[in-house]
Interface confidence: medium
């Protein structure tokens, strides 16, 4: 037997697990595909990315809208020559998410 | 040219990207390795898991301490035989994290 309070708690948790934009730590270099002689400090930034659960296994949490936000980072060249330079780096920020079908696989692939 | 205020903003963001326990959505069935004829509703729960950035590429964010927390979920058997039952499910919750060296690779692997 279960009471309404227990169900409310379960429902609230479920709502929180749903597919939605959530703050995520992303590695800037991987994002930008920068050359190996340039790196960024901090190496990671916080942005919103789609994540969470979908009701069905055939669905995945995908972004439906994206904005690009500018983060101030130190761009450092190796070997170090000048004082590290602050540069604006644009990183994708997911603003909308939806549970969408995974891309159908070709029967012969 | 950058001022101290800019550096403070960067520093605050960097602190937030550090390796630490962060709320994550995990799929219960995968966690428990349950048989395919049993599934849970909600299928996902929120727990804390280690995540975030480490200063060096050779380090990864790993859990150093774990507690197990109980989540009330509906366990449903397929085919449905009885009323879904609320069961307590224990899920790992990371309480401490550290940037640790990745396992050294065997030279012949």
């Amino acid at each position: 037997f279960y009471d309404i309070e227990t169900l409310k708690v379960i429902d609230e948790e479920w709502q929180r697990t749903q597919c939605s934009p959530r703050e995520t730590c992303v590695e800037v270099a991987s994002e930008l595909g920068k050359s190996t002689n340039t790196f960024f400090k901090p190496p990671c930034v916080n942005v919103f990315r789609c994540g969470g659960c979908c009701n069905e296994e055939s669905l995945i949490c995908m972004n439906t809208s994206t904005s690009y936000i500018s983060k101030q980072l130190f761009e450092i060249s190796v070997p170090l020559t000048s004082v590290p330079e602050l540069v604006p780096v644009k990183v994708a920020n997911h603003t909308g998410c939806k549970c969408l079908p995974t891309a159908p696989r070709h029967p012969y692939s | 040219f950058y001022d101290i205020e800019t550096l403070k903003v960067i520093d605050e963001e960097w602190q937030r990207t550090q390796c630490s326990p962060r709320e994550t959505c995990v799929e219960v069935a995968s966690e428990l390795g349950k048989s395919t004829n049993t599934f849970f509703k909600p299928p996902c729960v929120n727990v804390f898991r280690c995540g975030g950035c480490c200063n060096e590429e050779s380090l990864i964010c790993m859990n150093t301490s774990t507690s197990y927390i109980s989540k009330q979920l509906f366990e449903i058997s397929v085919p449905l035989t009885s009323v879904p039952e609320l069961v307590p499910v224990k899920v790992a919750n990371h309480t401490g994290c550290k940037c640790l060296p990745t396992a050294p690779r065997h030279p012949y692997s």
């Epitope: 340039t38 400090k41 901090p42 130190f74 761009e75 060249s77 170090l80 020559t81 000048s82 004082v83 590290p84 330079e85 602050l86 540069v87 | 040219f1 950058y2 001022d3 101290i4 550096l7 403070k8 960067i10 520093d11 960097w14 200063n55």
Partner: antibody
């Protein structure tokens, strides 16, 4: 408000080691991207960059003087220390502590160090 | 090391008249990131150097607009459109593109 102040002996003898301390306020050397460095200026001459230290303890030295210089920091005390070994009369100069940004904006007032027997 | 050569060494000026200082580097100051880290400082008598111009032509906050910087590659110029009495002192150019960061020998500006 950012301030930097140098302290150390006004007079050192040849072959001795010079130890200079920079005490700063208005910022922290634990802040991401922050650096503190040293620049000197012999009387009536040009400025010469010596060394600097970054928030994560990376250190950079002028290659010409590298073997004689050591820079270190005490973040909790807001201090950076420069030591220079085997002092010579040609090292007589005003030594400035600077906050390292690109370019140098905040400088200490400088401390004159004379090397003489 | 990058050698920074300033001319003239001394510059006697009349208040209200323009003044120009040249700075030449022994190597291009264009960084691989595209920026040129050439800066100008003024050291007034008995004081620490103060930043006037950064990255060739950007006036630092509070610096009067009579000061301007120009140039590229290895040749740079600081201009004062109308010299004032408070502008006396030694002007230094400086590069922070290449380690070690280096300074010019200075140009002493004095009132005639």
């Amino acid at each position: 408000q950012v301030t930097l102040k140098e302290s150390g002996p006004a007079l050192v003898k040849p072959t001795q080691t010079l130890t200079l301390t920079c005490t700063f306020s208005g910022f922290s050397l634990s802040t991401y991207g922050m650096g503190v460095g040293w620049i000197r200026q012999p009387p009536g001459k040009a400025l010469e960059w010596l060394a600097n230290i970054w928030w994560e303890d990376d250190k950079y030295y002028n290659p010409v003087l590298r073997s004689r210089l050591t820079i270190s920091k005490d973040t909790s005390k807001n201090q950076v220390v420069l030591t220079m070994t085997n002092m010579d009369p040609v090292d007589t100069a005003t030594y400035y502590c600077v906050q390292v940004t690109n370019p140098f904006v905040f400088w200490g007032e400088g401390t004159l160090v004379t090397v003489s027997s | 090391d990058i050698v920074m050569t300033q001319t003239p060494l001394s510059l006697p000026v009349t208040p209200g008249e323009p003044a120009s200082i040249s700075c030449r580097s022994s190597q291009s100051l264009v960084h691989i990131n595209g920026n040129t880290y050439l800066h100008w400082y003024l050291q007034k008598p008995g004081q620490s150097p103060q930043l006037l111009i950064y990255k060739v032509s950007n006036r630092f906050s509070g610096v009067p607009d009579r000061f301007s910087g120009s140039g590229s590659g290895t040749d740079f110029t600081l201009k004062i459109s109308r010299v004032e009495a408070e502008d006396v002192g030694v002007y230094f150019c400086s590069q922070s593109t290449h380690v070690p960061w280096t300074f010019g020998g200075g140009t002493k500006v004095e009132i005639k």
